[in-house]
């Protein structure tokens, strides 16, 4: 059985099929006698009761409200209710590109690695019974393939699979021929093989602090996915409660690398916080690199060369 | 898919130790911390400690300080908690689960690895 | 230790309620907080993350708040799969602690 639609905020293209269906649909079976009813909001209009006398395009089912298209004009706020139960989606319908075969705003982005196993499988498990066949096109072309019922590409990566593909079904409903296009826009990048992981800026980090203030020690690294980052400090981590590393950030690189940043707060600084290492590693199979930290006081400054401070 | 397999239940005398195991599949295993937790009969959550297991550091409970151990063998991804001299008020079931503080962005919804994956539990019985 | 203190205990609602969790720190913990469901015989699901970050894969329908001392758990319409019992941690520092959890029941 197709899944509910969990999603509160949905956008779709003019002109195609389309289906909302709530997620309370096993209780829904169990109190069959109970009033179920689907409305629609939108600007100046509230809350109107929607069943098939409203629209011929609309028809209502056990859990599902289908739309025999979709048009602009069906934007707006729907609502499923059942006794105590409601659930809510905000529908934007979106123009389609009359100049395309398919409609830029509803492509789905993937990075596929050059040799890598890829792979493009046309389904529409929703409305496969009602689909006549199926045509897979890359940039807009044809693609002669064996089955026409479901389409698909499986091999390994080559840089000239780049491109856009796009599933198009084609159905029947009440005498009406239609169609629902899904569109993939395939990226094919390097092989991204591990880096050797690298702390970024220097390797020992003079910071210039008053006692009672805070400090936060940032590190950051470029890493690969597996790769760990941590502080070290004192004997045990945690046996001081004025210390805290915060959250580990990781975001993507469009390499398909991960900068990361770690955190490390102390709090309320006393003696024991000084001329002590602060050590942040990255540690990957192929080996650790660690950068370090003192604490000095400000007015120790003059002691130490400028260039060797961070703020 | 993403799991972790705790061994079964145990009975056990006072006074006694116990060691529970949690296997780790689906992913690096010493990419990630592992923590433990335990809850008691109709009893709330209780966080017994965390290991780091790419570097053997560990934080424990300060009640269960010199009675718990923490450790991993990282060849076959598996991490285990040893309790000794164990009391009647151990009795629990044992939850480990993977356990880092780090926020990863790919995309466009961020992932949350802080006890995100636990165990099924093992239930430790300590009666005489 | 950061005591964790959750209210109420204990509480009575229908299906399609507003339901409020309060979580309460005996410290400043910043934004360091999770929010965990947990059904009898289950092991516990983590729902929230950093007082009001949604994990990947929960419903929109939990939300969190708070930071400081006081924090919010929020479920925004109560749904049948939605009766269980509800724990916060702190993740501020260690020894990590759990609030001693809110039990949702069905009036």
């Known amino acids: 059985a197709e899944s509910c639609t969990s999603r509160p905020h949905i956008t779709v293209v003019e002109g195609e099929p389309f289906y909302l269906k709530h997620c309370s649909c096993s209780l829904a079976h169990e109190i069959e006698t109970t009033t179920k009813s689907w409305y629609k909001s939108s600007g100046s209009q509230e809350h109107v009761e929607l069943n098939p006398r409203s629209s011929s395009r609309i028809a209502l089912h056990d859990c599902v409200l289908e739309f025999w298209p979709v048009e602009l004009n069906d934007t707006g706020s729907y609502f499923f209710q059942m006794k105590n139960y409601t659930q809510k989606w905000k529908l934007n319908v979106i123009r389609r590109n009359k100049h395309s075969c398919f409609t830029e705003r509803q492509v789905t982005s993937k990075i596929v690695e050059v040799k890598k196993f890829f792979q493009i499988t046309c389904e529409n498990s929703y409305y496969q019974t009602l689909v006549n066949s199926t045509s897979l096109y890359k940039n807009c072309k044809k693609l002669l393939l064996e089955n026409n019922k479901n389409p698909t590409i499986k091999k390994n990566a080559e840089f000239e699979d780049q491109g856009y593909y796009s599933c198009v079904h084609f159905l029947h409903h009440n005498g009406k021929l239609f169609n629902i296009t899904k569109t993939f826009n395939i990226t094919i990048v390097e092989d991204r093989s591990n880096i050797v992981p690298v702390l970024l800026g220097p390797k020992l980090n003079h910071v210039a602090v008053e006692l009672g203030k805070n400090v936060r020690l940032n590190c950051s690294a470029l890493l690969n996915e597996e790769d760990v980052i941590y502080w070290m400090f004192g004997e045990e981590n945690g046996s001081d409660p004025n210390i805290h590393e915060e959250k580990e950030m990781r975001i993507m690189t469009p390499e398909g690398k991960w900068h990361a940043s770690k955190v490390l707060r102390i709090e309320n600084i006393g003696e024991s916080n000084l001329n002590v290492l602060y050590n942040c590693t990255v540690a990957s199979t192929g080996g650790t690199d660690t950068k370090s930290f003192i604490l000095v006081r400000k007015a120790d400054m003059a002691d130490i060369p400028g260039h060797v401070f961070t703020r | 898919q993403v799991q972790l397999v705790q061994s079964g239940a145990e009975v056990k005398k006072p006074g006694a130790s116990v060691k529970v195991s949690c296997k780790a599949s689906?992913?690096?295993?010493?990419?990630?911390?592992i923590s433990w937790v335990r809850q008691a009969p109709g009893q709330g959550l209780e966080w017994m400690g965390w290991?780091?297991?790419?570097?053997?550091?560990?934080n424990y409970a300060q009640k269960l300080q010199g009675r718990v151990t923490m450790t991993t063998d990282t060849s076959t991804s598996t991490a285990y908690m040893e309790l000794r001299s164990l009391r009647s008020d151990d009795t629990a079931v044992y939850y480990c689960?993977?356990?880092?503080?780090?926020?990863?962005?790919?995309?466009?919804?961020?992932?949350?690895?802080?006890?995100?994956?636990w165990g099924q539990g093992t239930t430790v019985t300590v009666s005489s | 230790a950061i005591q964790m203190t959750q209210s109420p205990s204990s509480l009575s609602a229908s299906v399609g309620d507003r339901v409020t969790i309060t979580c309460r720190a005996s410290?400043?913990?910043?934004?360091?907080l999770g929010w965990y469901q947990q059904k009898p015989g289950k092991a516990p699901k983590l729902l929230i993350y950093a007082a009001s970050s949604l994990q990947s894969g929960v419903p929109s329908r939990f939300s969190g708040s708070g930071s400081g001392t006081d924090f919010t758990l929020t479920i925004s319409s109560l749904q049948p799969e939605d009766f269980a019992t509800y724990y916060c941690?702190?993740?501020?520092?260690?020894?990590?602690?759990f609030g001693q959890g809110t039990k949702v029941e069905i009036k």
């Open positions: 410290q400043d913990i910043r934004n360091d």
């Open positions: 689960a993977r356990d880092e503080a780090r926020i990863v962005v790919a995309g466009t919804t961020p992932y949350y690895y802080g006890m995100d994956v």
């Open positions: 941690l702190q993740d501020y520092n260690y020894p990590r602690t």
């Open positions: 689906g992913y690096t295993f010493n990419s990630y911390g």
């Open positions: 290991i780091r297991t790419y570097n053997g550091n560990t």
